[in-house]
Amino acid sequence: AVNGTSQFTCFYNSRANISCVWSQDGALQDTSCQVHAWPDRRRWNQTCELLPVSQASWACNLILGAPDSQKLTTVDIVTLRVLCREGVRWRVMAIQDFKPFENLRLMAPISLQVVHVETHRCNISWEISQASHYFERHLEFEARTLSPGHTWEEAPLLTLKQKQEWICLETLTPDTQYEFQVRVKPLQGEFTTWSPWSQPLAFRTKPAALGKDT
């Protein structure tokens, strides 16, 4: 399996969590493995046990502290190692010099709520969770609305190129059920990626008033 394509990918949530995925093509791994994090300028180190998420991939979360604590900065380098047990010893499978603020993936936005809804419009707000104060306003969002008879994949993406934690959806159909999701991404970082999508928020537009031209 050493010649197979392997991947070791980790992301920092900007506060106190590094999530890692270790995958080995063609490998049936029945041994126990872990990720070990060793910062270059901190007194702590942390370990998490890799647990299977599919036949050839394993994941774990390095919990570095309280959820909103700022455990790493832009100057930190964390040496990440995948260690697997071979008999009585641990074998190093992978090593990476991980720069947390080059590998960001924030938590999904939370607390989605309908601020105001009309027949054709809906104003929705949300909050970001466990995001570093270092970003100030350097964040962007993507949003999508699920219309009846469509899938999420078909929903057009709305891009908000600034830290704007609300949106006004327009040209909606009266008396219609919709769902809405949003995700966030910092502008910083070579390997930074979008957060997961938020939990969907369901809402219904108001019915058109009878006898009125809408």
């Epitope: 392997s6 991947q7 990918t9 040496t79 190093v92 090593i95 010099d97 991980f98 070579e190």
Partner: nanobody, 127 residues
Framework: QVQLVESGGGLAQAGGSLRLSCAAS????????KAWFRQAPGKEREFVAA????????DYADSVKGRFTIARDNAKNTVYLQMDSLKPEDTAVYYC????????????????????WGQGTQVTVSS
Amino acid sequence: QVQLVESGGGLAQAGGSLRLSCAASGRTFSQDAKAWFRQAPGKEREFVAAITWSGRDTDYADSVKGRFTIARDNAKNTVYLQMDSLKPEDTAVYYCAVYPQGTIGPYFRSSNHYDYWGQGTQVTVSS
């Protein structure tokens, strides 16, 4: 774009030494791993050694362990391969390569992981 230029190759006697250099220019990466591969005539390209961004961790093919040393100088954007106790079977074209995401280890020795390559430098070891 990334340019990688190898130098330092040449002819050496068995038991002798050579030091290869690979200078990178153009785009730089935040946490890349750099590696040396080699290809002998009629053979597939094979992994020689790799080094993490900080230079603190290295990985070597069994065939060169204890004889070759990989090092890097990020200020100069250069990676080195010190080759000692050379053997005729070390004869090959030596290539420098970059893996931007930066993981090294026994499961990351495939050339598929490496996105950027130099043109190579010839090393010939005579007996």
